[in-house]
Amino acid sequence: IWELKKDVYVVELDWYPDAPGEMVVLTCDTPEEDGITWTLDQSSEVLGSGKTLTIQVKEFGDAGQYTCHKGGEVLSHSLLLLHKKEDGIWSTDILKDQKEPKNKTFLRCEAKNYSGRFTCWWLTTISTDLTFSVKSSRGSSDPQGVTCGAATLSAERVRGDNKEYEYSVECQEDSACPAAEESLPIEVMVDAVHKLKYENYTSSFFIRDIIKPDPPKNLQLKPLKNSRQVEVSWEYPDTWSTPHSYFSLTFCVQVQGKSKREKKDRVFTDKTSATVICRKNASISVRAQDRYYSSSWSEWASVPCS
Amino acid sequence: RAVPGGSSPAWTQCQQLSQKLCTLAWSAHPLVGHMDLREEGDEETTNDVPHIQCGDGCDPQGLRDNSQFCLQRIHQGLIFYEKLLGSDIFTGEPSLLPDSPVGQLHASLLGLSQLLQPEGHHWETQQIPSLSPSQPWQRLLLRFKILRSLQAFVAVAARVFAHGAATLSP
């Protein structure tokens, strides 16, 4: 058993049929010694008396808010949550496995630049009685500060018969050094509580590996005289790190016909313009990637050929 | 060329070669199917590699003030990785294929380090750790970790030379 926060405790349980459970001793936070009784949740059934209460925690029915009283007055509360371990593996029932980039990916994180600011998100099908708490640091043995805001519900989607909820959080490294080569990964820890179930999820990454630039901006076409060719031009996204002579991007320009089956023409360039042939009913798209480190490509910015 | 006395390197040549290094480092390190490198105890193998850190003057401001600190750190790293790629970790079993990008990477590391430091000048270099795993699979794992950290190192070096070529070239 360990304390998650004031008056909230997590009981770690090996979860299998007929498991013995954990013996837990609760102590009433009061100078009083006599006439103390204990109840669980809204029930008025007295579970025991005295300053301490010893219980055997085996299942969710044994978890909940234990309250000690004296003469009708509440003295203190202890909320017990359960953390299940099945076959040596902690349960991951609350969050959905996003399976990208690999199985057992519950948290996904992205950064738009090297400033030390990043966003993480996760998915769940649970809509109520759900709380999240996020902590983060750079390195684990001698951790350096990363400040995270509160996790918020950022999207709702319908997937088949199920509703899926996306939560996200923004974090900022306290003293980021954008030009340095990271040697210690960022660690992100999410505590998730659904009703009386506790779970924790972690992710470890370097900012460089989660970089995904915003799409190029101001995408424009300029027809070239007496030719089917056009000059495509664009600019670095505003959110990308500066100066651009140091934090450089590379670009992919794609000409795509109306039909998905039509052959795509692609050009790769380090410049912010390119000359391509504009086919009728086609569209031109451009996306960006860090020039020197192969992290994610941005989403496409597109304009129609016409 | 960057020499301890402080003259300027051939920024444009360094830029081209460092960008080639980035491409080669990514060709040489495919995503590893069944090895999750972070779970395989990175600390003992990659703590010893030279990293370009915050105080090394490799940021745009630091380069403008005095690029020598940064160039020395990059040179140190290039020599370190060049030695690693020429060591038993990479020459042992499983053998490199004749046209492996690793071979070209090794040659390019040497090329860039020589551009930064002509014969006769000596910057201090770091000892390479004596890592010589006996099993091929351990060697393979170590190769992936080294290439992974090399990708990060050459990315910073390439940014430095690109910025230098754009803003510091005579």
């Epitope: - | 499983p94 990008p101 393979l140």
Partner: antibody, heavy 120, light 107 residues
């Protein structure tokens, strides 16, 4: 998820040629090599050759030299194996399998196989 | 070229039995030997890499050992689904070669 998907079964006459394709997905194609392995009915595995998708360099089994050509198309992440002057003993299931483009390595994953039948 | 010789060629075994398949190389190949399992009408599947390393997702009953010229694949407690042909493969020197295969039948 890494996948190699091969083209469908072929029936050829002796003396003809066959070209089998192997489309890769789920990984950086140019950072690996593709091996071709064949298996005659009821027999074991026979390595035919290897191509680096990084450099295009090839190595062929000595006794197929001159009859086999391996190529890659990095724009479509596809590897091809062409076998010419087919004989009846070329009847086999042909597999493509991924290995490193850096060092001598194991094969994983394998394509589903393409049955080539050579019969007059 | 390096010749890999497996033994036995065929083995009929009962579930829960321990099975040992050996692979001998005609010259030293260090640790560059891999094992594959092939079930009827399926592609080969990688089991063990570099003589002793279990590949991802492979049941723990499969293990490998050996180096130099003599290698062993062990199935510690055979299950019905292990009925297949097992091949060793060397990646030490081109041309890559395979053993002739060992067919395991479940009694």
């Amino acid at each position: 998820q890494v996948h190699l998907v091969q083209s469908g079964a072929e029936v050829k006459k002796p003396g003809a040629s066959v070209k089998v394709s192997c489309k890769a997905s789920g990984y950086t194609f140019s950072s690996y090599g593709i091996n071709w392995v064949r298996q005659a009915p009821g027999q074991g595995l026979e390595w035919m050759g290897w191509i680096s998708a990084y450099s295009g360099n090839t190595d062929y089994s000595q006794h197929l030299q001159g009859r086999v050509t391996m190529t890659t198309d990095t724009s479509t992440n596809t590897a091809y194996m062409e076998l010419r002057s087919l004989r009846s003993d070329d009847t086999a299931v042909y597999y493509c399998a991924r290995a490193s483009a850096n060092w001598y390595d194991y094969f994983d994953p394998w394509g589903q196989g393409t049955l080539v039948t050579v019969s007059s | 070229e390096i010749v890999l010789t497996q033994s036995p060629d065929f083995q009929s075994v009962t579930p829960k039995e321990k099975v040992t398949i050996t692979c001998r190389a005609s010259q030293t190949i260090g640790g560059s030997l891999h094992w594959y399992q092939q079930k009827p009408d399926q592609s080969p599947k990688l089991l063990i890499t570099y003589a002793s390393q279990s590949f991802s997702g492979v049941p723990s009953r499969f293990s490998g050992s050996g180096s130099g010229t003599d290698f062993t694949l062990t199935i510690h407690s055979l299950e019905a689904e292990d009925a297949a042909t097992y091949y060793c493969h060397q990646s030490s020197i081109l041309p890559y070669t395979f053993g002739q295969g060992t067919k395991l039948e479940i009694k």
